[in-house]
Amino acid sequence: KSSNEATNITPKHNMKAFLDELKAENIKKFLYNFTQIPHLAGTEQNFQLAKQIQSQWKEFGLDSVELAHYDVLLSYPNKTHPNYISIINEDGNEIFNTSLFEPPPPGYENVSDIVPPFSAFSPQGMPEGDLVYVNYARTEDFFKLERDMKINCSGKIVIARYGKVFRGNKVKNAQLAGAKGVILYSDPADYFAPGVKSYPDGWNLPGGGVQRGNILNLNGAGDPLTPGYPANEYAYRRGIAEAVGLPSIPVHPIGYYDAQKLLEKMGGSAPPDSSWRGSLKVPYNVGPGFTGNFSTQKVKMHIHSTNEVTRIYNVIGTLRGAVEPDRYVILGGHRDSWVFGGIDPQSGAAVVHEIVRSFGTLKKEGWRPRRTILFASWDAEEFGLLGSTEWAEENSRLLQERGVAYINADSSIEGNYTLRVDCTPLMYSLVHNLTKELKSPDEGFEGKSLYESWTKKSPSPEFSGMPRISKLGSGNDFEVFFQRLGIASGRARYTKNWETNKFSGYPLYHSVYETYELVEKFYDPMFKYHLTVAQVRGGMVFELANSIVLPFDCRDYAVVLRKYADKIYSISMKHPQEMKTYSVSFDSLFSAVKNFTEIASKFSERLQDFDKSNPIVLRMMNDQLMFLERAFIDPLGLPDRPFYRHVIYAPSSHNKYAGESFPGIYDALFDIESKVDPSKAWGEVKRQIYVAAFTVQAAAETLSEVA
């Protein structure tokens, strides 16, 4: 059957009908419904919400909606033994204690089960010692401390400001530096936009607000006790000592009022430069230890959180495809939140809910998509992408054979300035074409397309007249689909103006103040940005599931491969002498990229010309497109990161949130001048060039004529 036979309306009309059915008022209503109480992973409240969503998706008209449960390692504070940090005097008396909870926002004073701020998966411990301020605790910050300033963090408690990189990377860096504890805090320089009031009067972080979050270094493993396999009823679980990615030192987050009390007493070295200073009225001295009168005082951490194997629930909804039911387009976003989840995740979950409702409405009118659409409400994303990863591990054989695309749907907004898209190059043309058909919600762009406002506000750094589309990193539920399984993936949300707002993420991220009111009062009162994001995410899913030829353009991959090869070559060329000495050549990689470019170009020509009424040829061409992303997967994975298997993209080893291109080569080259055995180090660079060149060439060949 062609797609037109699968439906009683034309494809163009379908997309319009689908988009027209999406309503801002519904998204608003769903967001309100999802944010009235906390939905922490592993709690009864989140189980109840899973059942509610299951029931509503069934009502909306999906063919089936099932709960998929797993028993995974989660982490919770001890209810009777709270976590806190003290300043202690020489007698060991606690003369200052950090707060035990965030002051609740207006209207939420009587809500129970608000989890106090904590760093999920922190081990227990009560270390005490001198404090060292380590800026953002990035790799380069520790280089500055250890190499330039000759400051030793061994046996010290470090205090780091949130922002710039994933908190798990900060903790890993601190551990490697020998620290015995980590204090994370939100500096107003990063979480307080000038000229905006703090919540509840504006969208800025108040001094008592604290960012929760996990501090794992899972590298794509999923449940720490069952890496590679689903945490099901008969799972074999590792002992806690062998668990993947757990931190080895206590960690705790605080707000800037508490941070002020710790930082104002800091002595020792002055900050190396202005980039180490935040916005608090403190010296930002690095330490170690306190100054003058306070030099005998120490910092003590009191951490009593516990790790517990706990049941989690994904909701999986299916809308069966009429023509290619064995081809899956997946729309997934998480449901669990740290507290109310006003933005993260429920602004995304509300959009998914409305997309499901719209698809369900079309289905009730007799329409079906060409391909099967799977909808997912993931659990335990905040604890390390656990729900999505366990489900993908359980269904990996189906997914690697049948997975066409994955569209992520976490927070719909992190600002209200312009669109932000991260995706595989295969989806660039889909995103461009779709946004040209959608109306911009932005002020000053009435009657203009979303593409136009997006391009104006966020121009591509390489191509004039085009918008910026970023690389996929991690820190969200697309990770297992893209980085492990090689399924083409993308994400879209509305974002802030990065040029004028230098704070990291949005100020109230993962705090108790991330409420419905935050969104309704300050970010999107008309829910017009939510609606636009619903149109982008939903429109992408619609096209991927319904277009006769998959809307992937392999030529865009060729373009970026050349760009990434140029970039990694220029990094390597910072060491011309060593490249000569060790005979390091990138010829094989550039040759493979050239071949890929030529073959992709020929494939695209054939794609224009083939007989689309021949279902066998159509399926064959679509399979070549579907499996192209898969062809970039190396079954052996990246060095020391077996679940990051994509050779072109991986999360940065220094920041999980960021994507790195040719990560194998990049990591081999990183800080190579400091390696004790240069011959071995450059040998690894050569090996990584070989792997990359082979993979690009192999991927190119999947696009060649089959015989």
Epitope: F96, P188, G207, G208, Q260
Partner: antibody
Amino acid sequence: QVQLVQSGAEVKKPGASVKVSCKASGYTFTYFDINWLRQAPGQGLEWMGGISPGDGNTNYAQKFQGRVTLTIDTSTSTAYMELSSLRSEDTAVYYCARDGNFPYYAMDSWGQGTLVTVSS
Amino acid sequence: DIVMTQSPLSLPVTPGEPASISCRSSQSLVHSNGQTYLHWYLQKPGQSPQLLIYTVSNRFSGVPDRFSGSGSGTDFTLKISRVEAEDVGVYYCSQSTHVPTFGGGTKVEIK
């Protein structure tokens, strides 16, 4: 809303001591330092010192060092200022003021003032 | 200690007209974090002082937009675009970059 309520007026003899209280409400007491200032009749404002309720740390203006003692009682969210060896020139209205934390770092809330008269 | 010098000492004003007060510090008020902790307070007759402007140019909550602050380093100005009767009182500049100190005050009164 934030409120600082001070104790009532005092009349003291030279050489005596006076202790003024300042009860805070409407905010988390331990987050904000309390400053003490005075204003002699017809004169400007003079900072005497400050105390951090979070850890009891004090900071005194050099002029008052040894004569002023700042204390706190976190259980009642009350700050105290005691001035000893009073002389006639200490006659003034004494104010407590909350030291606004970020982004203000200014005295964002003031008590109503306590008139201390030193007279023989 | 840092000395804060205000001028004029007294400022007779006509309602609806602008007014300007100057404040000079004996040394720079730029903190090591780059911020300048220079503030303006108003003490209305018989009342406690109240914060008007913080960190040079930011209006405190509830302060009308006819009040504005400017300046940098050691020289600062408070402007009232159109004086109203309720604006009478003594205006103080103050710094908290170092140990807090206040200017001598400027008395604003209606002509």
